[in-house]
């Protein structure tokens, strides 16, 4: 039994008074010629001539989907009864942006739900939103083709000082979150260990507060907080970080035992397990994947394995007893 099969049942369409069996008899050579499919569409049951009462199904090319009623009906006068049907793109095309902006990830097409991040060269920030998501066949929020990079006020203010500081005469002092952060700066997702909560904060405010010795604030990732693997890893990383022997400042972030600061992006990048050096007395007893055997790993290995989203259960700190 097929739902698409036509056994000649006398169906009545929603907006038709006449049953198919009531249609006038037609001569064999009459009927309808092949209809013209909508743009980016094609006819599934393609042939030269269709009988009166026969339906054709409109399908769309890969990357497009039908919107509207996708069946055409052959009428006695040789024309087609067709509702409004079109093939709408289900993917977004890589946006055209000014050359100074970098799109990550760089692809030709993006599926619905996929996001892109726009970034600028060092010392510059995107003059507007930096994260865009493919919804339907367009980007949300819409990407303006006049979108460009502007000088990062943070960089201007800091002079020769570190991030979160500003030049005051010949010395560096912490920026004031209230007074020095009224300008636009990119959004960061931040975790506060005191409140055990994460929130979106402008970069300037986060850096100023961190400079003022707010040690409870931890950088999670660039961009506003959004549920997903990046946030999940950011939180897990924060928990692991308390045992890290290495704490290396890197852009907005701090890199730990299992990470390396990328010189070109000023971001902490997870090492891969084989890149871990054996040294260090921060050991953990773990169970890998579905294995029942226990294994002693150092903090670097634990960090890289969790960063790679591989299944691992931490049984307890220290060496496995067996």
């Amino acid at each position: 039994f097929s739902i698409m099969e036509n056994n000649g049942q006398p169906c009545i369409n929603d907006d038709e008074e006449m049953k198919e069996v009531d249609l006038p008899e037609i001569e064999a050579d009459s009927g309808c010629p092949q209809p013209v499919p909508p743009e980016n569409g094609f006819i599934r049951n393609e042939k030269q001539l269709y009988l009166v009462g026969e339906d054709v199904e409109i399908s769309c090319l890969t990357g497009f989907e039908t919107v509207g009623y996708q069946y055409f009906r052959c009428l006695p006068d040789g024309t087609w009864r067709q509702g409004d049907v079109e093939c709408q793109r289900t993917e977004c095309i890589k946006p055209v942006v000014q050359e100074v902006l970098t799109i990550t990830p760089f692809q030709r097409l993006y599926r619905i739900g996929e996001s892109i991040e726009l970034t600028c060269p060092k010392g510059f920030v995107v003059a507007g939103p930096s994260r865009y998501t493919c919804q339907g066949n367009s980007w949300t929020p819409p990407i303006s083709n006049s979108l460009t990079c502007e000088k990062d006020t943070l960089t201007k203010l800091k002079g020769h000082c570190q991030l979160g500081q500003k030049q005051s005469g010949s010395e560096c002092i912490c920026m004031s979150p209230e007074e020095d952060c009224s300008h636009h700066s990119e959004d960061l997702c931040v975790f506060d260990t005191d409140s055990n909560d994460y929130f979106t904060s402008p970069a300037c405010k986060f850096l100023a507060e961190k400079c003022l010795n707010n040690q409870q604030l931890h950088f999670l990732h660039i961009g506003s907080c959004q549920d997903g693997r990046q946030l999940e890893w950011g939180l897990e990383r924060t928990r692991l970080s308390s045992n890290s022997t290495k704490k290396e400042s890197c852009g907005y972030d701090t890199c730990y035992d299992w990470e390396k600061c990328s010189a070109s992006t000023s971001k902490c990048v997870c090492l891969l397990p084989p890149q871990c050096f054996k040294g260090g007395n921060q050991l953990y007893c773990v169970k890998m994947g579905s294995s029942t055997s226990e294994k002693t790993l150092n903090i670097c290995e634990v960090g890289t394995i969790r960063c790679a989203n591989r299944k691992m259960e931490i049984l307890h700190p220290g060496k496995c007893l067996a």
Partner: antibody, heavy 118, light 112 residues
Framework: EVQLVESDGGLVQPGGSLKLSCVAS????????MAWVRQGPTKGLEWVAT????????YYRESVKGRFTISRDNAKRTLYLQMDSLRSEDTATYYC???????????WGHGTLVTVSS | DVVLTQTPSTLSATIGQSVSISCRSS???????????LYWYLQRPGQSPQLLIY???DLGSGVPNRFSGSGSGTDFTLKISGVEAEDLGIYYC?????????FGAGTNLELK
């Protein structure tokens, strides 16, 4: 200076066996994972196997699983690759490699040629 | 396995000329926490491969800064700004974002 020196390879018949070794110097051998990478005439560069610090964990590419065994002797600062049931497609120059925080294959030996042919 | 396609397969250049090599991946190398494990190696005639670029755009230790890497997702580029005689050889891209680690087939840079 990091140095990795592979033993001589050689000509082996299909189905035969060969054990490669790699002697390391210039760094604390037991503190690093180690790997074998090969370069065949047709397949180009291919990662073969990786071993952790003490040999308790080993990883292989699918095509060599069950035929090749990576092992190490930290006291001798030596990495091994036991190759059994050799096939013509295993013909390649085999390199011993050590990672760094920059890359998985940061340091390479000079390589040793293994030819599998009748 | 992830396939890395390098173009061109051979590149003829004159000393001082700037050249680019492309490496295209069969799937995105950007993982779900935002890291991309893409590397570039140079294998000079009769020598072992030598690391040039790691993590897409970071320069390997002791590598001259005429070498630069860029790209994201599936498209990556190695640029040499002013080729020197010692740069001749075969260039390989390699990915470690997905197991097993795979290499491109190589681009042979030769003198015109």
């Amino acid at each position: 200076e990091v140095q990795l020196v592979e033993s001589d390879g050689g000509l082996v018949q299909p189905g035969g066996s060969l054990k490669l070794s790699c002697v390391a110097s210039g760094f604390s051998f037991s503190d690093y994972y180690m790997a074998w990478v090969r370069q065949g005439p047709t397949k180009g560069l291919e990662w073969v196997a990786t071993i952790n610090y003490d040999g308790s964990s080993t990883y292989y590419r699918e095509s060599v699983k069950g035929r090749f065994t990576i092992s190490r002797d930290n006291a001798k600062r030596t990495l091994y690759l036991q190759m059994d049931s050799l096939r013509s497609e295993d013909t390649a120059t085999y390199y011993c490699s050590r990672p760094s925080t920059e890359a998985l294959f940061a340091y390479w030996g000079h390589g040793t040629l293994v030819t599998v042919s009748s | 396995d992830v396939v890395l396609t390098q173009t061109p397969s051979t590149l003829s250049a004159t000393i001082g000329q700037s050249v680019s090599i492309s490496c295209r991946s069969s799937q995105s190398l950007l993982n779900d926490v935002g890291n991309t494990y893409l590397y570039w190696y140079l294998q000079r005639p009769g020598q072992s491969p030598q690391l040039l670029i790691y993590l897409v755009s970071d320069l390997g230790s002791g590598v001259p800064n005429r070498f630069s890497g860029s790209g994201s997702g599936t498209d990556f580029t190695l640029k040499i700004s002013g080729v020197e005689a010692e740069d001749l050889g075969i260039y390989y891209c390699m990915q470690a974002s997905h197991a097993p680690y795979t290499f491109g087939a190589g681009t042979n840079l030769e003198l015109k």
